[in-house]
Interface confidence: medium
Amino acid sequence: VTGSRVYPANEVTLLDSRSVQGELGWIASPLEGGWEEVSIMDEKNTPIRTYQVCNVMEASQNNWLRTDWITREGAQRVYIEIKFTLRDCNSLPGVMGTCKETFNLYYYESDNDKERFIRESQFGKIDTIAADESFTQVDIGDRIMKLNTEIRDVGPLSKKGFYLAFQDVGACIALVSVRVFYKKCPLTVRNLAQFPDTITGADTSSLVEVRGSCVNNSEEKDVPKMYCGADGEWLVPIGNCLCNAGHEEQNGECQACKIGYYKALSTDASCAKCPPHSYSVWEGATSCTCDRGFFRADNDAASMPCTRPPSAPLNLISNVNETSVNLEWSSPQNTGGRQDISYNVVCKKCGAGDPSKCRPCGSGVHYTPQQNGLKTTRVSITDLLAHTNYTFEIWAVNGVSKYNPSPDQSVSVTVTTNQAAPSSIALVQAKEVTRYSVALAWLEPDRPNGVILEYEVKYYEKDQNERSYRIVRTAARNTDIKGLNPLTSYVFHVRARTAAGYGDFSEPLEVTTNTVPSRIIGDGANST
């Protein structure tokens, strides 16, 4: 029965005399008067079986002590650790010439675990063991004897097991413990590859090459290899494994990404939080599912936020010129979180009697610069039929529009070709300018060409250069433009609309808002 004692992880104990409970029962030769089994104590009051001999008075001592058979367990080289006390011959009176201060260590390989006798000739000598510390009689009085620890190794071994033997030639020795062990490189994980327990090589300089296997939920990047050194230490890790998609490295293991996290590829990266507008509901996600109403385009990386189609374009303006129409609009208020916004134009030809009966315009109509995938916010449509009602839809589209097309993404206008629109307005005046508003007034166009249905005022900050404009419509020939910024230059255009469509815009009127209220009369030229 062997008690548990703690030794380094790279040592595998084959024999430990201190852990044996009960008698060791090793074979001594001679049976009497040589080595004697003596029970002493350890610090926990547990008996330790030791072997002692002290025949220092008599010459020509040849006392042998042989262990039981020790299994090799596949080790090619084993280590023997001996802890012992040894008496200083100088402290013993009258023993000159007979007292020795060394003993000899031998081994014998055998497949037979039941050899009953010691045949000295079968044993090979490992070494002569001497003490670093020998004790005198005074030490015994002081109750202290330092233990000597000597370690020897022997190999290569080839048989199933072996016996050790201790030869005393006339010393005063107590073998307090004998431990036999071999060295291994203990099971370890490096670079996500597991390397098994590996017994060291046969000689003290050999390196054993070991191939590792990737831990669960990982895959080889480069073939993982390490070398097991003779001292039981792993050396020179080569290659590695990477955690699979949906897994990340934690303490040498590949753990599934937590809920709300993902990892798309086999890399050494950690799991990342799901991008905006997406989620994962399982552990080990390789991508995140888009929230309801949000989508990911085919070429969007898993790391990109989920996006949605844009809202409709704003402020659509049409300008009819016989069988041509110019359309202009502003960007949508909501781009859906994407940069790849473009515009498609849908042209429908509608019956005069029933505007609801509309058909596609067909291939005879031409668009400048193009009908679909427009990057600008204007288009010219030509080669329309005269005296015909047309409805034009401007669709804002992005990379995910195809997943959720909706009328909410378009704006439309209906026009009739081949009717004269009103002429442009000649004079626009700023009647009153304050910090936050401008009061405009204008005259009717010289040629209204019919009943003027409404006026449209287009204005923008001068330095915005028409990139972002606003529209105000009114039936009167004046209007108050409110919500302006103080001390800012604005440009105003006005045009009239009849049943035939819009006329051209007036010449620009530039007005700068004030810090102090004052009345300014404009004459169509710049006003400050």
């Epitope: 003596v38 001999v53 220092v56 009085g141 107590a174």
Partner: antibody, heavy 126, light 112 residues
């Protein structure tokens, strides 16, 4: 269990010698330190010397050097203490006491006197 | 030689009460291995001494836990948490760091 059985009481003349025996049982005799301690009537304890049988020779208190001899017979597990040139002040109870050797991972030391004999009264009188 | 001095030499105690005996050595009993080489013994009337405490603070096998040893270097104490009638006798401290092994002069514990 461990037992130390001492020889019987002795009456000795001044100048003579006395040899007290202590037979051990219940443990490995050779591995334990055997001490001898005496106690004069109404007095305290006085250490005389000791021996580890396996290691042969004994060591003694300076006070008794030259007058005391401690030996051990491994074959009978018996320790002996012989005191010569007896004087009246050597009248005392003589005890044998054993101390086990204790080994840690780095050293061995001798524990306290775990077991005592029953004592042998030696009277020195003319 | 190491001189051991005990106090008090006589200690009358009421049963159930605690008792404390002091022992002072003329030089340190602390070995480099961390152990204090001091033992305590009790000699009951008409009996051989018996080991109570070894190496300063370790209770010997079979000794009741009301006995405890403490101290280090040159100052040591034996404490009995609740004295019982069977605890009467002479208590000795002993140093075993170096030869000759020496004892204190003894403290006689008696019941009031």
């Amino acid at each position: 269990q461990v037992q130390l059985q001492q020889s019987g009481a002795e009456v000795k003349k001044p100048g003579s010698s006395v040899k007290v025996s202590c037979k051990a049982s219940g443990y490995t005799f050779t591995g334990y330190y055997m001490h001898w301690v005496r106690q004069a009537p109404g007095q305290g304890l006085e250490w005389m010397g000791g021996i580890i049988p396996i290691f042969g020779t004994a060591n003694y208190a300076q006070k008794f050097q030259g007058r005391v001899t401690i030996t051990a017979d491994k074959s009978t597990s018996t320790a002996y203490m012989e005191l010569s040139s007896l004087r009246s002040e050597d009248t005392a109870v003589y005890y044998c006491a054993t101390a086990p050797m204790v080994c840690s991972s780095t050293s061995c030391y001798l524990r306290g006197f775990d077991y005592w004999g029953q004592g042998t009264l030696v009277t020195v009188s003319s | 030689d190491v001189v051991m001095t005990q106090s008090p030499l006589s200690l009358p105690v009421t049963p159930g009460e605690p008792a404390s005996i002091s022992c002072r050595s003329s030089q340190s009993l602390l070995h480099s291995n961390g152990y204090n080489y001091l033992d305590w013994y009790l000699q009951k009337p008409g009996q051989s001494p018996q080991l109570l405490i070894y190496l300063g603070s370790n209770r010997a096998s079979g000794v009741p836990d009301r006995f405890s040893g403490s101290g280090s270097g040159t100052d040591f104490t034996l404490k009995i948490s609740r004295v019982e009638a069977e605890d009467v006798g002479v208590y000795y401290c002993m140093q075993a760091l170096q030869t000759p092994i020496t004892f204190g002069q003894g403290t006689r514990l008696e019941i009031k």
